[in-house]
Amino acid sequence: NIDVCKLGTVTVQPAPVIPLGSAANISCSLNPKQGCSHYPSSNELILLKFVNDVLVENLHGKKVHDHTGHSSTFQVTNLSLGMTLFVCKLNCSNSQKKPPVPVCGVEISVGVAPEPPQNISCVQEGENGTVACSWNSGKVTYLKTNYTLQLSGPNNLTCQKQCFSDNRQNCNRLDLGINLSPDLAESRFIVRVTAINDLGNSSSLPHTFTFLDIVIPLPPWDIRINFLNASGSRGTLQWEDEGQVVLNQLRYQPLNSTSWNMVNATNAKGKYDLRDLRPFTEYEFQISSKLHLSGGSWSNWSESLRTRTPEEEPVGILDIWYMKQDIDYDRQQISLFWKSLNPSEARGKILHYQVTLQEVTKKTTLQNTTRHTSWTRVIPRTGAWTASVSAANSKGASAPTHINIVDLCGTGLLAPHQVSAKSENMDNILVTWQPPKKADSAVREYIVEWRALQPGSITKFPPHWLRIPPDNMSALISENIKPYICYEIRVHALSESQGGCSSIRGDSKHKAPVSGPHITAITEKKERLFISWTHIPFPEQRGCILHYRIYWKERDSTAQPELCEIQYRRSQNSHPISSLQPRVTYVLWMTAVTAAGESPQGNEREFCPQGKAN
């Protein structure tokens, strides 16, 4: 709150703007007839220093010259960059009660001279854009600094524009509002930037450029694609461009891809034929432009055109598998399964599948279309049957895939040997085997088939399978493999007209079961006890159960229990034991064992055999 200097004046030497590290002398003078009322010698002039409106110092001790009661000069040093406010006040020393009265004030700015502007870069966006230049101003000056951008060119013309930097705004870019047109393509322009403030001035080095150096074409617009005869692989990409463009870069990719296909097109005039597109695929297309074959800059990429290529008829063959179940003495149920074509083979939306079952000798043919990936029919058990399936989209159908229907596990000599299943990690199982020992006919291929061992899995869930060439003896199965679930795995060896199989159970990860089997009944027959149980609920098995254990001991005995270990069979739910004494009460229970360990015990049952036991 400085009054408008009624009492006196404050002056600065050498100037109110000084370079960093310089000292300044501040003189405070009272106007005539101003000051303390009684006598001038009681006038005391003090100088206060403020930074950001905060009093930081009383410069009483920095007085270098004093006309008592009239004026004082103070030397200030070590001023920091930016603005510092100094206020001179009058202190009437005889009156302790009155606060000092403001006389006048001054602001001193400390800064540096501007550095020469560097890295000047000019750009004109599009043929009808305007020239804008930017530069690097160098170190902050802490002072108001004016910049003049000067562009000299043909017709003896110079264009200039100014802006300034201070503590509120930065000036390092100017748009001159002038357009350079293609008729100036051969002309040279010179640009320079001059910076000036109260402490000095500096100029950039001149920077020379041509029209082609600085004009960046606008990105192409109105992009569209026309597919020739509704082809899914050939299309003509069209776009609008600025008139002077001579070179285009096209990039395109399927939407889920991570790498672009790149094409350079010279004198394309807004049109280019693409011949390697994938049918029925979502593509993204972008185009960039350049005004000169060798010099100049590429435009930004255009906005993306996203479109799907048309369908084409499916290619590739379906992977077919089947299951055979006898219904009665003269009928069998055939269930055919097949895997969906991958998108590059389907080349469109598969509308349906054409399924054919044919009896080879009698020429009986069953045909149907289905939208599903399985098909079930009841056929006679007699005769040699073959199946074929093809996939159809709006443009046509794939070539049919044929498979001979044979008794998949009918030929023992074709059964693979030494089948094993090892867990590789959480979600796959490595299956290995040895070829059949005495196969009558050559193995054409192996099929590894797997299904979760859970109630109703045969009816509810289709099998999963892998086709393996005849010279491979292993398969890593991962599709639909989950940890802590036991799978039945079959390895089929198929010849032209026969099949043999071997089965094993496997899991990808296992834990000890959550609980033991539940003993439901203990019965005595012919001097033997039969223990019956219900299997552990599927979610509680936590992998493949290797065997069950039946434990027993005399009631109230502290001795270790005896046990009997039974190989796990899914179909078995009772087992005899014959080493119990008659008329002794026993406690019995069961546990289940996986590769990870033994379950807690199941329920306990007491039983006292009556008859004579061995």
């Epitope: 009808n128 305007t130 060119g153 043909p154 017709n155 013309l157 264009c159 200039q160 524009k161 100014q162 748009d175 001159l176 509002g177 002038i178 357009n179 350079l180 047109s181 008729d183 100036l184």
Partner: nanobody, 127 residues
Amino acid sequence: QVQLQESGGGLVQAGGSLRLSCAASGRTFSNSVIGWFRQAPGKEREFVAALSWSAGSEFYVDSFKGRFSISRDNAKNTVYLQMNSLKPEDTAVYYCAAKNPPHRWSDIGKSPQYAYWGQGTQVTVSS
């Protein structure tokens, strides 16, 4: 319709200064370029300086740069030409003119590109 009115011309001694004014009526200069041209007796009209109203850029013929400067007053919708160190060969009728976009480098100094013209003001520099 834009009307342009020059003023500030007159007789001045060599080495002296004059400030010419160009006031627009009818509409603002907004996105125009306002140029100063001059025509000496028996000579072709020649470009002196111009100002892009919206961009704030100034254009000078190299031979006048340093002696002449162009400026504006937004509130008064007026453009000025400050002429210092005048010489007898600066004697001419000085015209102000306005051109519409686009503003191309090639067109700035060409009088046919300017659609609106004032009546001119006489500047005479005596030796």
